[in-house]
Amino acid sequence: HKCDITLQEIIKTLNSLTEQKTLCTKLTITDILAASKNTTEKETFCRAATVLRQFYSHHEKDTRCLGATAQQFHRHKQLIRFLKRLDRNLWGLAGLNSCPVKEANQSTLENFLERLKTIMREKYSKCSS
């Protein structure tokens, strides 16, 4: 079976997000990926979308992320734009209305996105072969 176009869009967005750091990418996010042993793939994607939404909702107007220059502000706006796109596409892939997110360890956003990219690339290699 062919790969979902949403999956390709997610990988593309993750590539954009992981190529460059911003002031916000060192901040922490709930690491649901480390605690996804006994969950279905759909639940993992749903939880990833949930924690990403929590992250950008919390940090969208965070002065630590907005920075002191127009350049840093622009990059932060771009980061939020890509996170919102990723969130939207993960919900589409998950196909679930909601999912519980338990307390878990924290990870930096950049590490979380790198691991999510690895998971998505593995999924893509399986569905394209």
């Epitope: 954009s16 460059q20 127009a70 350049q71 502000f73 990059r75 706006k77 771009q78």
Partner: antibody, heavy 123, light 106 residues
């Protein structure tokens, strides 16, 4: 294909204000997430960034020129402009306008440049 | 302000030679580094972005590497049309260019 073209007087008197305009063709200057910048190059020397203006309308300027520089955008004319006040002979240079930013990246600095315009400061 | 130190300031090499230019940042700039080529009387042309990515349409003999503070730009086999001045540029915190490296043919 996006093109940038600088225009303005080639000769400015000392202590006056240098005014240049960059006209963008082949695309909209309002297109998010692109931003616009000015860079200059004195004869026989290297490149110096002057300043940039972003989609939000916010600007960044080179700290060494900040007190004398203003960059603004006129979306109706698809142009952005540079004003540099109290010029001296040290401001004699080729002035370039350029585009930064990208749709598929967080940032991407100055990939498209105008051809440049020579400005001489002399009485 | 972030300072960019580029070396050498000029070099002379033969056609087919491997040419290497280095750029050092005064602080960590991650991978926010571009390399430009400027021919006499022309505007700079972006060759490499984010330290190692080749801009579309740029020949594969051009390459870049590095991260943090130390960066390298390489022309694997110098061609006559590569005669130009090359600049590095950081855009991690505002924008600063290196002093340039003038490349000539022996």
């Amino acid at each position: 294909q996006l093109q940038l073209q600088e225009s303005g007087p080639g000769l400015v008197k000392p202590s006056e204000t240098l005014s240049l305009t960059c006209t963008v063709s082949g695309g909209s200057i309002s297109s998010i997430p692109y931003y616009w910048g000015w860079i200059r190059q004195p004869p026989g020397k290297g490149l110096e960034w002057i300043g940039s203006i972003y989609p939000s309308g916010s600007t960044d300027y080179n700290p060494s020129l900040k007190s004398r520089v203003t960059i603004s955008v006129d979306t109706s004319k698809n142009q952005f402009s540079l004003k540099l006040s109290s010029v001296t002979a040290a401001d004699t240079a080729v002035y370039y306008c350029a585009r930064g930013g990208a749709r598929d990246r967080i940032d991407h600095a100055f990939d498209i440049w105008g051809q440049g315009t020579m400005v001489t400061v002399s009485s | 302000d972030i300072q960019m130190t580029q070396s050498p300031s000029s070099l002379s090499a033969s056609v087919g030679d491997r040419v290497t230019i280095t750029c050092q940042a005064s602080q960590d700039i991650s991978n926010y580094l571009n390399w430009y080529q400027q021919k006499p009387g022309k505007a700079p042309k972006l060759l490499i972005y984010d330290a190692s990515n080749l801009e579309t349409g740029v020949p594969s003999r051009f390459s870049g590497s590095g991260s943090g503070t130390d960066f390298t730009f390489t022309i694997s086999s110098l061609q006559p049309e590569d005669i130009a001045t090359y600049y590095c540029q950081q855009y991690y915190d505002l924008y600063t260019f290196g002093g340039g490296t003038k490349v000539e043919i022996k």
